[in-house]
């Protein structure tokens, strides 16, 4: 014989000894009908705030207040936003590894420092976990066949570099 609890809708509960669908009491929910009990609604307060309110058919969803971010499945914990020089991982905020940086507050990932030599430039200022390297002007490289002559220009003390 089919149990009439099987026909109960979400938002209700039903006990097998008295198989009548009853509405979930306030502050409780059931996303599946026919369960013997409704679940207690989640509360979002303190470092949490509501992203969804609890209804008879679904639980509340929480998010973290400004300046904090969620950790864990369904935002079980709130952690202070990462500072520049850090990135958010599953384990929380982690300092950027050597050779990488993040200059953003609360968001972003650690990115590799710019490789100045790829552009034929020198490193003017070394990078940190919070700041990228500063590249200098392009390095002038000379081939063996290049001759250089310094010729006076514009009167005394004036010189110009000529690459021949």
């Amino acid at each position: 014989v089919q149990n009439s609890c099987d026909n109960c809708q979400p938002g209700t509960f039903c006990r097998k000894y008295n198989p009548v669908c009853k509405s979930c009491p306030p502050s409780t929910f059931s996303s599946i009908g026919g369960q013997p009990n409704c679940n207690i609604c989640r509360v979002c307060a303190g470092y949490f705030r509501f992203k969804k309110f609890c209804s008879s058919t679904h639980n509340a969803e929480c998010e973290c207040i400004e300046g904090f971010h969620c950790l864990g499945p369904q935002c079980t914990r709130c952690e202070k936003d990462c500072r520049p020089g850090q990135e958010l991982t599953k384990q929380g905020c982690k300092t950027c590894s050597l050779g990488t940086f993040n200059d953003q507050n609360g968001t972003g990932v650690c990115r590799p420092w710019t490789n100045c030599s790829l552009d034929g430039r020198s490193v003017l200022k070394t990078g940190t976990t919070e700041k990228d390297v500063v590249c200098g002007p392009p390095v002038v490289s000379f081939s063996p066949s290049t001759t250089i002559s310094v010729t006076p220009e514009g009167g005394p003390g004036g010189h110009s570099l000529q690459v021949l």
């Epitope: 306030p26 502050s27 509501f50 969804k52 209804s55």
Partner: antibody, heavy 113, light 106 residues
């Protein structure tokens, strides 16, 4: 900064459908939900419903059968529709951000023939 | 639905006087929220998470309570505090408001 602004007809005939628009700025509808609340003249506040960040909705069971809330995220607009209007639907209609920290200035709707 | 019963309906207080407004819930709620509304204006969130003052709310206001009994207290009444105050629960939908308490200046 965060702003919400309601717009709609001031006068509606009984049995007709009321359509209101809430235009928001300073936040995204894909991040935060928006409520509709109404207040009949000289009376208290009544929560009507909410559309969430993901488009899901919750309604006040007392008026759920006549109510529909939708949105257009590209225009940052939330819509309220109430059908089969009665004179006791005459009220100031407000929209508010999910945490009720920002409200629109409200739009007065009179249901009368 | 959770019914919130506010008392008193109206209260008149002299400047400097202490005022307490109560809100009782038909079933237990986790936190209470309070709003201030002045004539012709939109409501303003006044107290959240039972006891935290919203931005810009003077600290002569306070909130307390748990379970089914909550209150808003005003330590020393000032003329600018004359308004209607509403309690509200967020524990489950439908979110419900109290019927309001009109605070007048004597």
């Amino acid at each position: 900064q965060v702003q919400l602004k309601e717009a709609g007809p001031g006068l509606v005939q009984p049995t007709q459908t009321l359509s209101l628009t809430c235009t928001v700025s300073g936040f995204s509808l894909t991040s935060d939900g928006v409520h509709w609340i109404r207040q009949p003249p000289g009376k208290g506040l009544e929560w009507m419903g909410i559309i969430y960040y993901d488009g899901g909705t919750d309604y006040n069971s007392a008026i759920k059968s006549r109510l529909s809330i939708s949105r257009d995220t590209s225009k940052s607009q939330v819509f309220l529709k109430i059908n089969s209007l009665q004179t006791d639907d005459t009220a100031m209609y407000y929209c508010a951000r999910i945490h009720f920290d920002y409200w629109g200035q409200g739009v007065m709707v009179t249901v009368s023939s | 639905d959770i019914v919130l019963t506010q008392s008193p309906t109206t209260i008149a207080a002299s400047p400097g006087e202490k005022v307490t407004i109560t809100c009782r819930a038909s079933s237990s709620v986790s936190y209470m929220y309070w709003y201030q509304q002045k004539s012709g204006a939109s409501p303003k969130l006044w107290i959240y998470d039972t006891s935290k003052l919203a931005s810009g709310v003077p600290n002569r206001f306070s909130g307390s309570g748990s379970g089914t009994s909550y209150s808003l207290a005003l330590n020393t009444m000032e003329t600018e505090d004359a308004a209607t105050y509403y309690c509200q629960q967020w524990s489950s939908t439908p979110l419900t408001f109290g019927s309001g308490t009109k605070l007048e200046i004597k």
